[in-house]
Interface confidence: low
C-alpha cells in the first residue's frame, strides 16, 4: 500500500484564465433547494491560441434517486445516509463550434476535467485557490508524467464469453432526449477503500473525486446510448472490510465475495467499482470479471493511477466495458478505432499508454450490442427515477509489457512459435512475434505493403522494413479533390454527405439559398452570409431523433432543444470551386498548405495530411530522397 | 425507410446446406449493421450472425457452420448455412439498423422458413 505516493505532475501546461459568460437575469429570488450551482454556464478559456466557448449543463443524472453514502461513524459504527440537498457542481457539455466536442467539468472549486476539440483531449485544473477566475493550467494528458497503465484481463480469462455483434451509437449533444427504450443504465455502486481515503484525506474530498470519476465515465459511455448513473458510494474512512491486495485479481476476487454477503443490506445496483490507492503490482490499474454486468459477479477493481481523475476514469470505463462483454481491441482481428491522435488507442486497448482515451472502438462496440441481446442484459433497461435525479509484467497474459518481447499467452494456449511463452522472450533466430509487418518471425521487407488504401482519402502504408508494426494511418494531403468535396483528414466532407448523416439516407443538402443566411437564436430571424459555411441546412430524410429542428421554407436546421445553437457547416466541407469551410468562413484552399510539400518528396512520395512526405513503397522518410535498403544499410539496422 | 426481403429458406436433410439472401430495397452503404435473427416454435427471436462494412460476428451455436457476407453492389446480404441440423429449424429474419444522431432505426423481414429434417 502506497498512501503517501505523490500524485504525477504535469510536464507542460498552459496558465488560463477562465472567464464566466453572464447568465440570463434572473428577477426573483430562487427557491434553496435549488443550491448555488446554475443548471447551465459557460466559460470561455483562451488555450492553445484559441478561445473555447465551453457550454455546459449540469449532470441531473449523475445520482441515483435513493442515492446513498456509507461510511464509519466517530464511534466505530458504520452509517448510512441519503444526503439531503442533492446539489452539486458536475457538468457536461460541449465546446461552441465544434460539432464532435465534448466536455465534463466540476465547478466546484474552481474548474476541473477535461473538454476534447477534434482529436486533442485537453485537461483542466485549479492553480490555486482563485476559484472559476483564478489561474489554471490546461494541458493534454500526453504531458502528465506518469507511466502507461495495463489491464489486468488476460484474453484466458475473456474465453467463449465473447460473441461480437454490431452497436448502435450516436453522437450526445445537448439537448438530446433519447427512447428509454433505446437507452441503458447502469446503476453504479462505487466503494473506495482506506488507502485511497487516506492519500485524499477526507470523506469530502473522497466524495469529490468519485463523483469528478463517475461524471466522466457517464460521459465516455454516453457515445454508446448509455448512462452510468452513482445510486451509492462506501468510503472506508476508518479500514478495510476486506484485504486490498496488490494482486488486482486476488483485490477482484474480495470484492466480489463482500458484496454478494453484503447485497441483502446494500443498495441494489447493477455493478460494483473499488477504486484503490494502493499501487497494483506491475503495470495493471483495472481488473475484471467479464461479461457480468447484471449478474452477481458484476464488478471491478481500479487503481487511482494519475493525479487528473480522467485517469481512474478511463481505466473504470474500460473495466465497466469488459463488465458488458467487451474484448480488448488488440485481441479483434481488424478492429477499427477511429481516434486519430497520436498514441491512435481507444478506451478498450489493453495499456492505457501516455494519452487518456475517449472513444470505443468498432469491436467493442459490436461485443455491446452483443451483450445487450442477452437476457441477462435486462437489468440495464430499467431507468432510475428521474424524478429525483439530482502486478510486475505477467508473462503469459498476451500482454507484451516491460521486459517481454511478446506475449502469446500461456504455454498451453500459445500457437505462436516465434515467441517462448514460457520466458515471453522471441524464440531462437525470430526477429518479431506480433504485428501486421510480422511474417514467419522475420520481419516483413521494406515496401511490402501492410494497410491498403480505404478510400480516395486515405493513403496506403508500407512495411519499413524494420519494425514489425504497419506504420501510422496517414491520409491524403488535405485539400486532394475526393467525391464532390476535398480530403480534410482523412474524411470528404461535402454538404450531401453531412446531411445524410444526420437526416438518413434521404437527406441532402437543401437549396443553396438557404446557406444565404444564418439564424438566430429561436428560429425567430436570420443575417444575411456571403458564404456557406454557417448553419448546415438540409431537406429529405428523416428527422433525427432526440433533435430540434428550425423549418424556414426547404430550408431545415437542426438546433439544441432551446433553440440557442445549431448545427455548423463542418471545418474543411467544400464551399466553391477551390474552396473550403475553414474557421467557419469559406477560404481558399491554400489554408491547408504552408509550403509546397510535394516538392520536397523527391518524385518519390507525396505530401499527407500532416504536410509531411508520405513515401512511395521502398523509399524512406523524411524525404524520401533515399531507399529504405541504402538507410539501414548505413545505419547497421538492418534486421 | 428500408424495406427488406428474405428468400431461399426450405426443407433440407440434417448435415444439407442453405444459401439464405436478404435485398434491400435501398443501398445497403448506408445502413451501419445488418444480421441475421431466427425464431423457433415456441422461443424467443435468437440472434445468429451480423456484418458491417469491417467484422463479423456468429452466435456460438453457428460459429463454423454459417457464413454471413455482403454484396454492396446488389444490396443484399447472405447466409450461407451448412452441416444444418434438426435445431437449426426456425424462421429467420433479416434486420437492418441505420445510425441515426438520436440512437438506431432497426428495419425488420418478413422472415423465410428454415425446416431441418429427414
Known amino acids: 500500500i502506497a498512501p503517501s505516493r505523490p500524485w504525477a505532475l504535469m510536464e507542460q501546461y498552459e496558465v488560463v484564465l477562465p472567464w464566466r459568460l453572464p447568465g440570463p437575469r434572473v428577477r426573483r429570488a430562487l427557491p434553496s433547494h435549488l443550491g448555488l450551482h446554475p443548471e447551465r454556464v459557460s466559460y470561455v478559456l483562451g488555450a492553445t491560441g484559441h478561445n473555447f466557448t465551453l457550454h455546459l449543463r449540469k449532470n441531473r443524472d449523475l445520482l441515483g434517486s435513493g442515492y446513498t453514502e456509507t461510511y464509519t461513524a466517530a464511534n466505530g459504527s458504520e452509517v448510512t445516509e441519503q444526503p439531503r440537498g442533492q446539489d452539486h457542481c458536475f457538468y457536461q457539455g460541449h465546446v461552441e463550434g465544434y460539432p464532435d466536442s465534448a466536455a465534463s467539468l466540476s465547478t466546484c472549486a474552481g474548474l476541473r476535467g477535461f473538454f476534447q476539440v477534434g482529436s486533442d483531449l485537453h485537461l483542466i485544473e485549479p492553480l490555486d485557490e482563485g476559484g472559476e477566475g483564478g489561474r489554471h493550467a490546461v494541458y493534454q494528458a500526453e504531458h502528465l508524467l506518469q507511466t502507461a497503465g495495463t489491464c489486468g484481463v488476460s484474453d484466458d480469462s475473456l474465453g467463449s464469453l465473447l460473441g461480437p455483434r454490431t452497436a448502435a451509437v450516436f453522437r450526445p449533444r445537448p439537448g438530446d432526449s433519447l427512447p428509454s427504450r433505446e437507452t441503458r443504465y447502469v446503476e453504479l455502486y462505487v466503494v473506495v477503500d482506506n488507502a485511497e481515503f487516506q492519500m485524499l484525506g477526507s470523506e469530502a474530498a473522497v466524495r469529490h473525486r468519485v463523483l469528478e470519476v463517475v461524471n466522466h465515465v457517464d460521459k465516455l459511455y454516453q457515445k454508446l446510448n448509455f448512462r452510468v448513473v452513482l445510486v451509492g458510494l462506501e468510503i472506508w474512512n476508518s479500514q478495510d472490510r476486506f484485504h486490498v491486495s496488490p494482486d488486482p485479481s486476488v483485490t477482484l476476487e474480495n470484492l466480489l465475495t463482500w458484496q454478494a454477503r453484503q447485497r441483502t443490506r446494500r443498495h441494489l445496483h447493477d455493478n460494483v467499482q473499488l477504486i484503490t490507492g494502493v499501487d497494483f503490482t506491475g503495470t495493471t490499474v483495472g481488473f475484471a470479471r467479464v461479461s457480468a454486468m447484471c449478474s452477481h459477479s458484476s464488478g471491478a477493481v481500479n487503481q487511482d493511477h494519475s493525479k487528473n481523475p480522467v485517469g481512474v476514469a478511463c481505466t473504470m470505463a474500460h473495466e465497466m466495458g469488459h463488465n458488458l462483454g467487451m474484448d480488448h481491441d488488440e485481441n479483434v482481428q481488424g478492429c477499427r478505432c477511429q481516434e486519430r491522435f497520436e498514441a491512435g488507442r481507444c478506451i478498450m486497448a489493453g495499456s492505457i499508454g501516455s494519452s487518456f482515451p475517449r472513444m470505443f472502438s468498432d469491436c467493442s462496440q459490436a461485443y455491446l450490442e452483443s451483450f445487450l441481446e442477452r437476457p441477462q442484459s435486462v437489468c440495464l433497461a430499467n431507468a432510475p427515477d428521474l424524478s429525483h435525479l439530482v502486478g510486475g509484467p505477467v508473462c503469459g497474459n498476451l500482454f507484451v509489457e516491460r521486459g517481454e518481447q511478446c506475449d502469446c499467452g500461456p504455454p498451453e494456449d500459445c500457437r505462436n512459435r516465434c515467441c517462448n511463452s514460457t520466458t515471453c522472450q522471441l524464440a531462437e533466430g525470430a526477429q518479431c512475434a506480433h504485428g501486421t509487418c510480422c511474417q514467419e518471425c522475420k520481419v516483413k521487407p521494406a515496401g511490402e505493403l501492410c494497410r491498403p488504401k480505404k478510400d480516395m482519402c486515405d493513403l496506403e502504408e508500407f512495411c519499413d522494413g524494420r519494425h514489425p508494426e504497419c506504420p501510422e494511418d496517414a491520409f491524403q494531403e488535405n485539400g486532394t479533390p475526393c467525391s464532390g468535396g476535398y480530403c480534410y483528414n482523412g474524411a470528404c466532407p461535402t454538404l450531401a454527405q453531412q446531411c445524410q448523416a444526420f437526416w438518413g439516407p434521404g437527406g441532402q443538402a437543401a437549396e443553396e439559398s438557404c446557406f444565404s443566411y444564418d439564424i438566430l437564436p429561436g428560429c425567430k430571424a436570420s443575417r444575411y452570409r456571403a458564404d456557406m459555411c454557417g448553419v448546415l441546412q438540409c431537406k429529405g430524410g428523416q428527422q433525427p431523433l432526440g433533435r430540434a429542428i428550425c423549418i424556414v421554407d426547404v430550408c431545415h436546421a437542426l438546433t439544441t432543444e432551446d433553440g440557442t445553437a445549431y448545427e455548423p457547416v463542418p471545418e474543411g466541407t467544400r464551399c466553391g470551386p477551390e474552396k473550403v469551410c475553414w474557421k467557419g468562413r469559406c477560404q481558399d484552399l491554400h489554408v491547408y498548405r504552408s509550403s509546397n510539400c510535394s516538392a520536397q518528396c523527391h518524385n518519390h512520395g507525396v505530401c499527407n495530411h500532416k504536410q509531411e512526405c508520405h513515401c512511395h513503397a521502398g523509399w524512406a522518410p523524411p524525404h524520401c530522397a533515399k531507399l529504405l535498403t541504402e538507410v539501414h544499410a548505413a545505419s547497421g539496422s538492418l534486421p | 425507410e428500408v424495406q427488406l426481403v428474405e428468400s431461399g429458406g426450405g426443407l433440407v436433410q440434417p448435415g444439407g446446406s442453405l444459401r439464405l439472401a436478404c435485398a434491400a430495397s435501398?443501398?445497403?452503404?448506408?445502413?451501419?449493421?445488418m444480421g441475421w435473427y431466427r425464431q423457433a416454435p415456441g422461443n424467443e427471436r435468437e440472434w445468429v450472425a451480423s456484418?458491417?462494412?469491417?467484422?463479423?460476428a456468429y452466435a456460438d451455436s453457428v460459429k463454423g457452420r454459417f457464413i454471413i457476407s455482403r454484396d454492396n453492389a446488389e444490396n443484399t446480404i447472405y447466409l450461407q448455412m451448412h452441416s444444418l441440423k434438426p435445431e437449426d429449424t426456425a424462421v429467420y429474419y433479416c434486420?437492418?439498423?441505420?445510425?441515426?444522431?438520436?440512437?438506431?432505426?432497426?428495419?425488420w423481414g418478413q422472415g423465410t422458413q428454415v425446416t431441418v429434417s429427414s
Open positions: 434486420k437492418g439498423q441505420v445510425l441515426v444522431p438520436g440512437g438506431r432505426n432497426d428495419y
Open positions: 435501398k443501398s445497403i452503404d448506408n445502413i451501419h449493421a
Open positions: 456484418i458491417t462494412s469491417s467484422a463479423t
